[in-house]
C-alpha cells in the first residue's frame, strides 16, 4: 500500500536519519497546492510555480512541516521570465502559517511581497524574503520573530528589482531579535549600517548597498560576529558588467580605523569593490582570528607593495587581492611587500588582475617561507615573461595558476624560460578583464530560484586535475612551442594544464621530459600535430591525457596522424580526444594495455567506417582494458557490421548518442559480453530489439531517450532480468503491452523513464495504466509528464 497518491506531481523522498519526509514540487507549473501531499511531510518545496495565494487551508493537516520553500511563485517583473510575467503579487491570508507549530524554515523569496508576513509561528528560526518589494523595515513588523535566527532580506531594492525609494530601517528595528545569528541586507540600497544590531549576530551581509561611511560604533556590540561582508559599497566600477555608481569623487568606503575593534571573533571579512586605496593596519589590531580576507576589486596596487596590515593577520588562511590594477598602467613586474612573509597560516593567495609584464623569481621571495601556502593564483595578469623554473621553490604548492596570461616561449634554449620579444618598457595598457566572472559578477553569492543555497563559488582549477596533486595551470596563454628546458626543475608537478594555447608543433616525446611525475596533462584547445607515435611517451606516469579540441591539423587532408601513440603510454587510464574532427588516421589501430576510458566524441567515424572500407573497424580493438567508450556525435547514421567485432573485449559502457542513427544492429551486442550501459539517446531510431535478452545478458542500463520509437516489440523485455535502468522518454510510443513489459523484469528496475511520449489512453491501455498506478518502480515525472495524447477528453491528462 502506497502512502501517497501517484497523482501527486512531486518527488517524494525519505531522509531516514533525519526522520524527514521531503516533498519536492519544484517547477511543476502548479497553480494551486496539489492534493495528496502526505500528512507526515516535513519539508515541502513549491518553488517555481504560479500559485497565486496562501491561506490557512493551504497547509491544512500538514502539521509536521518543518520547512516550506515557497519561492518564486511571483518573481518581480524585471527579475522574472518575460514570457510568463507575474502581475499580481502573492497574497498571504492571515493565519496561513500560525498553526504550523513545528515550522522552522520559511522561504518566501521572489513573490513581490510588500511587507514581512504577519502571523508567523514562534517556532520559526529561518525566514527568507529576498527579491520581494519590502523596502521599509519597522520594529513592529518583526515582533513575532522572537526566535528567528536567520533572516534574509536582500535583493529588495537594487538595479534588477528597483524600488525607486530610499530603503529605510527604523532605529533599533532588529534589536529585539535576541536570537538572531544571520542577517542579510545585501543588494538593497541601504545607506547606513542599521543600529543597533543584536549582539548575537554571527554573520552580517551588507554588500552591494549605498553605504559611504561606517561609523565608529556601528559594530560596537557584535562580539560574536564571524562573517562581515561590506563589499560593493563605494564600488570600483571600471569594466563592471552591471549598472554601477561609485561614491562621490570615486572615494573609498570610509571605515574608521577602530571600527572593527569589537569584532574579536571575526573569521571572514569581505571588502571586495570598496574603492579602497589603503588598508590601515589598525583595522586588524583586534581581529587576530581572521581567516579569510577579500580585498579584490579595489585600488590597492601600491598598497600590495607596502601592506603593513599583513603583520596583524597571523591566522589568515585566504587572501584575495585580485583586480587591484591601476587604470592605464602596465607594470614592469610585481612588487610584493616583505610583509607577506608574516602570513604564516596562509593557504590561498589570489592576485589576479595586478597587470604586469614579467614575473621574476625575486618578486615571489616574500612567499618562499610560507609553509602552509597551497594555492598561488596569478591568473589574468597579462604576464608576458615568466621563467617557470622559479616554482621549484614552491614544491609544496598544490596549485600554481598562471592561466589567462600572455606567456609565450623564448626564442632559444637559454634559461630565460617562457618570455616574449616585446619591448620591456612599461606600456600603457587597458586589459579586457570582463571574462573573469568570479570577480565581475554583481552578486556572486546570489541564489537562483531552483536552489536554496548559494550557487557554487567559482573554482578556476580543473577539479579532476587538481586531485592528482601539484598543478601548474598555463591555460589560455600564448604558448606556441614547448621544449624540455621550459619545464626544468618542475619534476614535482602532477598536473599540467596547457589548454587554450597555440601549440602547433609535432611532439616527438622529448618536450615534457623533466616532468617525470606528471599524471594529468590537459592539452585541449591547441593545434596538436600527431606526426610521431612517440608523442607524450616521455610522460611515464601519465594517467589522464586530454587532447580534445585540437582539430586544426585533423581538418586538413594529407597529414600524418599517428593515433597509435597510446601504446607508449604505459599507465594511461583516460584519454579524451573529443571535438577533433578526426576523419583519417595513418595508424589503423590504437593500442593500450592500460587505457580504461576513451572519449572520442565529435569526430568523424562515419568517414573512417565508410561502407566498403574495413581498414579502421578494429581501431579500438587493441585497447585491451578499455571499459568506457564514448563515440557520440560522430555522424554515424548506421554502424557497419564489423564495428562490434572490432570493439575491445572488456567494454562496459558504450555511448553512441547524438549520431543520427536510423537503425541499430541489436543482435551484434552479443559481441560485447561485458556491456553494462548502452546510450543510444538523441538518435533517430524507430525500433527496439525483438527480445533484448537475446542480444545482451549483461546490459543493466539502456538509454533510448530522444529517438523516434513508436512502439515496443511484443517480447521486448522478456527475460531481461539484469536490466536496472531503462530510459524511453521523449519518443513517440503510443502503447505498451503487458508482454513487452513483463512484471518479473520490471520489478527489478530501479528507474523507468517514460515521460514525453504519445500514449493513447484507450481500452487497450488498461493493463499499462493499471500497472503504472500500482508499480513500486520509480517513474520520474509520472504525474505531470507521462500523459495521453488522446483520445479526445484524455488529451493532456496524466495516464494515472
Amino acid at each position: 500500500a502506497r502512502w501517497f497518491p501517484k497523482t501527486l506531481p512531486c518527488d517524494v523522498t525519505l531522509d531516514v536519519p533525519k526522520n524527514h519526509v521531503i516533498v519536492d514540487c519544484t517547477d511543476k507549473h502548479l497553480t494551486e497546492i496539489p492534493g495528496g501531499i502526505p500528512t507526515n511531510t516535513t519539508n515541502l518545496t513549491l518553488t517555481i510555480n504560479h500559485i497565486p495565494d496562501i491561506s490557512p487551508a493551504s497547509f491544512h493537516r500538514l502539521d509536521h512541516l518543518v520547512e516550506i520553500d515557497f519561492r518564486c511563485n511571483c518573481v518581480p517583473i524585471p527579475l522574472g521570465s518575460k514570457n510568463n510575467m507575474c502581475i499580481k503579487r502573492l497574497q498571504i491570508k492571515p493565519r496561513s502559517f500560525s498553526g504550523l507549530t513545528y515550522l522552522k524554515s520559511l522561504y518566501l523569496d521572489g513573490n513581490q511581497l510588500l511587507e514581512i508576513p504577519q502571523g508567523l509561528p514562534p517556532s520559526l528560526q529561518l525566514l527568507s524574503l529576498e527579491a520581494n518589494n519590502i523596502f521599509s523595515i519597522r520594529k513592529e513588523n518583526l515582533t513575532e520573530l522572537a526566535n528567528i535566527e536567520i533572516l534574509y532580506l536582500g535583493q529588495n531594492c537594487y538595479y534588477r528589482n528597483p524600488c525607486y525609494v530610499s530603503y529605510s530601517i527604523e532605529k533599533d528595528a532588529f534589536l529585539n531579535l535576541t536570537k538572531l545569528k544571520v542577517l542579510s541586507l545585501k543588494d538593497n540600497n541601504v545607506t547606513a549600517v542599521p543600529t543597533v544590531l543584536p549582539s548575537t549576530l554571527t554573520e552580517l551581509y551588507l554588500y552591494n548597498n549605498m553605504i559611504a561611511k561606517i561609523q565608529e560604533d556601528d559594530f560596537n556590540n557584535l562580539n560574536q560576529l564571524q562573517i562581515l561582508d561590506l563589499s560593493g559599497n563605494c564600488p570600483r566600477c571600471y569594466n563592471a558588467p552591471f549598472p554601477c555608481a561609485p561614491c562621490k569623487n570615486n572615494s573609498p568606503l570610509q571605515i574608521p580605523v577602530n571600527a572593527f575593534d569589537a569584532l574579536t571573533e571575526l573569521k571572514v571579512l569581505r571588502l571586495h569593490s570598496n574603492s579602497l586605496q589603503h588598508v590601515p593596519p589598525r583595522w586588524f589590531k583586534n581581529i587576530n582570528k581572521l581567516q579569510e580576507l577579500d580585498l579584490s576589486q579595489n585600488f590597492l596596487a601600491k598598497e600590495i607593495g607596502d601592506a603593513k596590515f599583513l603583520h596583524f593577520l597571523p591566522s589568515l588562511i585566504q587572501l584575495d587581492l585580485s583586480f587591484n590594477f591601476e587604470l592605464q598602467v602596465y607594470r614592469a613586474s610585481m612588487n610584493l611587500s616583505q610583509a607577506f612573509s608574516s602570513l604564516k597560516s596562509l593557504k590561498i593567495l589570489r592576485i589576479r588582475g595586478y597587470v604586469f609584464k614579467e614575473l621574476k623569481s625575486f618578486n615571489l621571495s616574500p612567499l618562499h617561507n610560507l609553509q602552509n601556502l597551497e594555492v598561488l593564483d596569478l591568473g589574468t595578469n597579462f604576464i608576458k615573461i615568466a621563467n617557470l623554473s622559479m616554482f621549484k621553490q614552491f614544491k609544496r604548492l598544490k596549485v600554481i595558476d598562471l592561466s589567462v596570461n600572455k606567456i609565450s616561449p623564448s626564442g632559444d634554449s637559454s634559461e630565460v624560460g617562457f618570455c616574449s620579444n616585446a619591448r620591456t618598457s612599461v606600456e600603457s595598457y587597458e586589459p579586457q578583464v570582463l571574462e573573469q566572472l568570479h570577480y565581475f559578477r554583481y552578486d556572486k553569492y546570489a541564489r537562483s530560484c531552483r536552489f536554496k543555497n548559494k550557487e557554487a563559488s567559482f573554482m578556476s582549477v580543473n577539479e579532476s586535475c587538481y586531485k592528482y596533486g601539484q598543478t601548474l595551470d598555463l591555460s589560455k596563454n600564448s604558448i606556441f612551442f614547448v621544449k624540455s628546458s621550459d619545464f626544468q626543475h618542475l619534476s614535482f608537478l602532477k598536473c599540467l594544464n596547457l589548454s587554450g594555447n597555440l601549440i602547433s608543433q609535432t611532439l616527438n616525446g622529448s618536450e615534457f621530459q623533466p616532468l617525470a611525475e606528471l599524471r594529468y596533462l590537459d592539452f585541449s584547445n591547441n593545434r596538436l600535430d600527431l606526426l610521431h607515435s612517440t608523442a607524450f611517451e616521455e610522460l611515464h606516469k601519465l594517467e589522464v591525457l586530454d587532447i580534445s579540441s585540437n582539430s586544426h591539423y585533423f581538418q586538413s587532408e594529407g597529414i600524418t596522424h599517428m593515433l597509435n601513440f597510446t601504446k607508449n603510454l604505459k599507465v594511461l587510464q583516460k584519454l579524451m580526444m573529443n571535438d577533433n574532427d578526426i576523419s583519417s588516421s595513418t595508424s589503423r589501430t590504437m593500442e593500450s594495455e592500460s587505457l580504461r576510458t576513451l572519449e572520442f566524441r565529435g569526430n568523424h567515424l562515419d568517414v573512417l567506417w565508410r561502407e566498403g572500407d574495413n581498414r579502421y573497424l578494429q581501431l579500438f580493438k587493441n585497447l585491451l582494458k578499455l571499459e568506457e567508450l564514448d563515440i557520440s556525435k560522430n555522424s554515424l547514421s548506421f554502424l557497419p557490421s564489423g564495428v562490434f567485432d572490432g570493439m575491445p573485449p572488456n567494454l562496459k559502457n558504450l555511448s553512441l548518442a547524438k549520431n543520427g542513427l536510423k537503425s541499430f544492429s541489436w543482435k551484434k551486442l552479443q559481441c560485447l559480453k561485458n556491456l553494462e550501459t548502452l546510450d543510444l539517446s538523441h538518435n533517430q531510431l524507430t525500433t527496439v530489439p525483438e527480445r533484448l535478452s537475446n542480444c545482451s545478458r549483461s546490459l543493466k542500463n539502456l538509454i533510448l531517450k530522444n529517438n523516434q520509437i513508436r512502439s515496443l516489440t511484443k517480447y521486448f523485455l522478456q527475460d531481461a532480468f539484469q536490466l536496472r535502468y531503462l530510459d524511453l522518454s521523449s519518443n513517440k510510443i503510443q502503447m505498451i503491452q503487458k508482454t513487452s513489459f513483463p512484471e518479473n523484469v520490471l520489478n527489478n528496475l530501479k528507474m523507468l523513464l517514460l515521460h514525453h511520449n504519445r500514449f493513447l489512453c484507450t481500452c487497450d491501455a488498461v493493463w499499462f495504466v493499471w500497472w503504472v498506478n500500482h508499480t513500486e518502480v520509480t517513474i520520474p515525472y509520472l504525474a505531470t509528464d507521462v500523459t495521453c495524447v488522446g483520445p479526445g477528453a484524455h488529451k493532456g491528462q496524466s495516464v494515472i
Partner: antibody, heavy 116, light 106 residues
Framework: QVQLQQPGAELVKPGASVNLSCKAS????????LHWVKQRPGRGLEWIGD????????NYNEQFKTKATLTVDKSSSTAYMQLSSLTSEDSAVYFC?????????WGQGTALTVSS | DIQMTQSPSSLSTSLGGKVTITCKAS??????IAWYQHKPGKGPRLLIH???TLQPGIPSRFSGSGSGRDYSFSISNLEPEDIATYYC????????FGAGTKLELK
C-alpha cells in the same frame, strides 16, 4: 561626557612596586583600547602599552615588557598599570588615554616619584 | 617602525601671529596623523585627527594639512591660551609621537 580619572601623585621607595589606576566613565569601557603613556621631566611622550578591556588583550612597548603589567577591572571600569622594581628612572608622569586609532581622551596624569 | 621627526623643537612667537609646526614621517602614513596640545599639570588635548579633521570644540584657528610623509600644523591669530607644547602622533602603523614643539612668547 568621557572622563579618565587618575590620582594626582604617588610616592614610592626604590625596589618597590606601584599600581596606578585610571577610572573611566561616560563611555562603554569594554569596547575601547586603553593606553598608558610616560612623560619624564623635560622629555617627550613615550608609549608604554595598551589593553582591550573586553578580553584583557595587551600589547607592550618592548622596553616596558618587564617593567609594566596592564590589567582591568570591568566591574568598576578601571584600568591598572603595575610598575615593578622601581628606580629613579621610573619617576615620571604617567597618563592613561582612550584610543580610537588616535588618543581622543587623556587622564590628567599621575606623578610618580621614586625616592627613599 | 615609523619615526616622526617634529620641527622645530621650540618656537618663540608673538600674540596674534601665525605659527607652523611640521612632522616628517619615515614613510607614507596615509594621512593618519593627529595633533595634541599639552599644558603642564594636564593631560594632552586632541586638536586634529586624520591630518585636518578638527575635534569638536576646537577653534578654527587651528588647522592641519599634508599627505604622504610630510605634514604641518598651524595656529593663526595666536592667543595667550595657546602657549603649550604640541605633539604629532602617527597612527597608520602602530603609534609614534613626535618629540614635541614648545611654544613660547617672545
Amino acid at each position: 561626557q568621557v572622563q579618565l580619572q587618575q590620582p594626582g601623585a604617588e610616592l614610592v621607595k626604590p625596589g618597590a612596586s606601584v599600581n596606578l589606576s585610571c577610572k573611566a566613565s561616560g563611555y562603554t569601557f569594554t569596547n575601547n583600547w586603553l593606553h598608558w603613556v610616560k612623560q619624564r621631566p623635560g622629555r617627550g611622550l613615550e608609549w608604554i602599552g595598551d589593553i582591550y578591556p573586553s578580553n584583557g588583550r595587551t600589547n607592550y612597548n618592548e622596553q616596558f615588557k618587564t617593567k609594566a603589567t596592564l590589567t582591568v577591572d570591568k566591574s568598576s571600569s578601571t584600568a591598572y598599570m603595575q610598575l615593578s622594581s622601581l628606580t629613579s628612572e621610573d619617576s615620571a608622569v604617567y597618563f592613561c588615554a582612550r584610543e580610537r586609532g588616535y588618543f581622543d581622551y587623556w587622564g590628567q596624569g599621575t606623578a610618580l616619584t621614586v625616592s627613599s | 617602525d615609523i619615526q616622526m621627526t617634529q620641527s622645530p623643537s621650540s618656537l618663540s612667537t608673538s600674540l596674534g601671529g601665525k605659527v607652523t609646526i611640521t612632522c616628517k614621517a619615515s614613510q607614507d602614513i596615509n594621512k593618519y596623523i593627529a595633533w595634541y596640545q599639552h599644558k603642564p599639570g594636564k593631560g594632552p588635548r586632541l586638536l586634529i585627527h586624520y591630518t585636518s579633521t578638527l575635534q569638536p570644540g576646537i577653534p578654527s584657528r587651528f588647522s592641519g594639512s599634508g599627505s604622504g610623509r610630510d605634514y604641518s600644523f598651524s595656529i593663526s591669530n595666536l592667543e595667550p591660551e595657546d602657549i603649550a607644547t604640541y605633539y604629532c602622533l602617527q597612527y597608520d602603523y602602530l603609534l609614534t609621537f613626535g618629540a614635541g614643539t614648545k611654544l613660547e612668547l617672545k
